[in-house]
Amino acid sequence: TQNKALPENVKYGIVLDAGSSHTSLYIYKWPAEKENDTGVVHQVEECRVKGPGISKFVQKVNEIGIYLTDCMERAREVIPRSQHQETPVYLGATAGMRLLRMESEELADRVLDVVERSLSNYPFDFQGARIITGQEEGAYGWITINYLLGKFSQKTRWFSIVPYETNNQETFGALDLGGASTQVTFVPQNQTIESPDNALQFRLYGKDYNVYTHSFLCYGKDQALWQKLAKDIQVASNEILRDPCFHPGYKKVVNVSDLYKTPCTKRFEMTLPFQQFEIQGIGNYQQCHQSILELFNTSYCPYSQCAFNGIFLPPLQGDFGAFSAFYFVMKFLNLTSEKVSQEKVTEMMKKFCSKSWEETKTSYPSVKEKYLSEYCFSGTYILSLLLQGYHFTADSWEHIHFIGKIQGSDAGWTLGYMLNLTNMIPAEQPLSTPLSHSTYV
């Protein structure tokens, strides 16, 4: 008789990242008997939900069920039927929903109610939908990248997981950029975290970590753009806004009502003598950079040092993984290589922004115009945020690693979130040693 292979003893988990601009579903898989080992959970699927973020469904919540269908059906296909009932599903909503909740708690609850009802109809173990805090978003992103880089493992390995991994156990800092917020999280060197709101204490795998984190709401790339437009239109002499952050020849009409829809532009709101205005791109990196800097208030700091807007930031320490939109934007601009210096990045941005809109469209025919038009702003914003906002320098720039995936798993908060909710990160180092390191190779 032939030996039959034993069925794989694996477990699955699903996390939906309900971001401000879109929702993504991630499926994770791990060997059941190695739940407490570091680095054994990996991503097997990402499904990007077609359409905007869930906060945009506030006036059409009856469409949420259909919106989620394709990716939930994909999860049904990927995960063996026998495991459906024990597969947990978590939905975490981030800054887009934080902003909606600021406007109206009832509207946010209305959206989440329908999301929960829709997801509960699938045969998985639905564990609810919630708006995670900015602090959680930062912390879980930090946990994710360090888990995937093997930084929590007590065994120092003679081989490297990823090209930029240093073989020491120093954790990486995490830089996350979304559409509506951005997070910075790292372990400062022997520095007291002067603001309690920014301090986190973890004990992971037998080691204590004092972690600094802050989430800047309204400083994601999309909300930062709305802020910049609202600021600039204040001083426009008519309905034409000549904007250095868009390519020369680019034109777009913006409704003033759309501009003031978000709580992020409230501080710039004023009565304008027109209902619409036209953005006319002039493509000048330096001017764009200057305009962006006006969004960061650096004149006030109640601590020994600050990032901006009076928020404490300790001196930067160690290597950083920059992911989500930091990565997507820099990848598009072909600036993710370890060898590209900050000076070179700035040069490339100057060149890119000054390119005419017609030429830009010709160079990237497959990229949707809406996204294509914003790369000049987004790239400039990333440089401004990292250099002037977080105080990276030309030297420390080399410690920023633009990361999309680590070992096939996306860098982002979702894996850390699931590891925490499924109790898969023990406080103490597990006694049993892993039988193999094959997951790392």
Partner: antibody, heavy 121, light 107 residues
Amino acid sequence: QVQLVQSGAEVKKPGSSVKVSCKASGGTFSKYGISWVRQAPGQGLEWMGSIIPEFGIANYAQKFQGRVTITADESTSTAYMELSSLRSEDTAVYYCARESGGYRDHRLGVWGQGTMVTVSS
Amino acid sequence: EIVMTQSPATLSVSPGERATLSCRASQSVGSNLAWYQQKPGQAPRLLIYGASTRASGIPARFSGSGSGTEFTLTISSLQSEDFAVYYCQQYLLWPLTFGGGTKVEIK
């Protein structure tokens, strides 16, 4: 004060379907979820499913998925629960109940009087 | 799904005495817990929601406590009309789930 009035008792044959109605009066109908809960003779309470009439969005317990359909008619402030492929184990009192806490608060504050459904050949 | 377990199944108490009913959730439900009273031939009636808030018209002798996974319903001094079956229900996650009930009977 909100009141829920359900349709009368039913006797059904195995394999058939039953549709129970629940009419609301004296309060907002659309915004609050309506849940359906059943109770077999001498047994506890079992949640079957729910709907928010405002959106027509229903969700169901896995056990009843594919066999139960919950709908609502805003114009008449009435919710309906239809259970198909009836078997003897479906003999129970079926209650509608209003989720009186608003969105995401599913405490059942107001109950109908119950509808006895007997499944017998 | 979240499993709700009630104990005891039956509680025999004399009128005027205190009754303490327990409810345990298989995972944390925060304070998303309700208690219902059901008398024979009647629909259930909401007594407590949010683990400890009395529903309107519910006498002060009924009180709820607890959060997370352990909850208690206390009837400080049982009246004749309080002899009934009591159910707990979690409403944090779908599906909504009820405990098996505690029958409070006259001793």
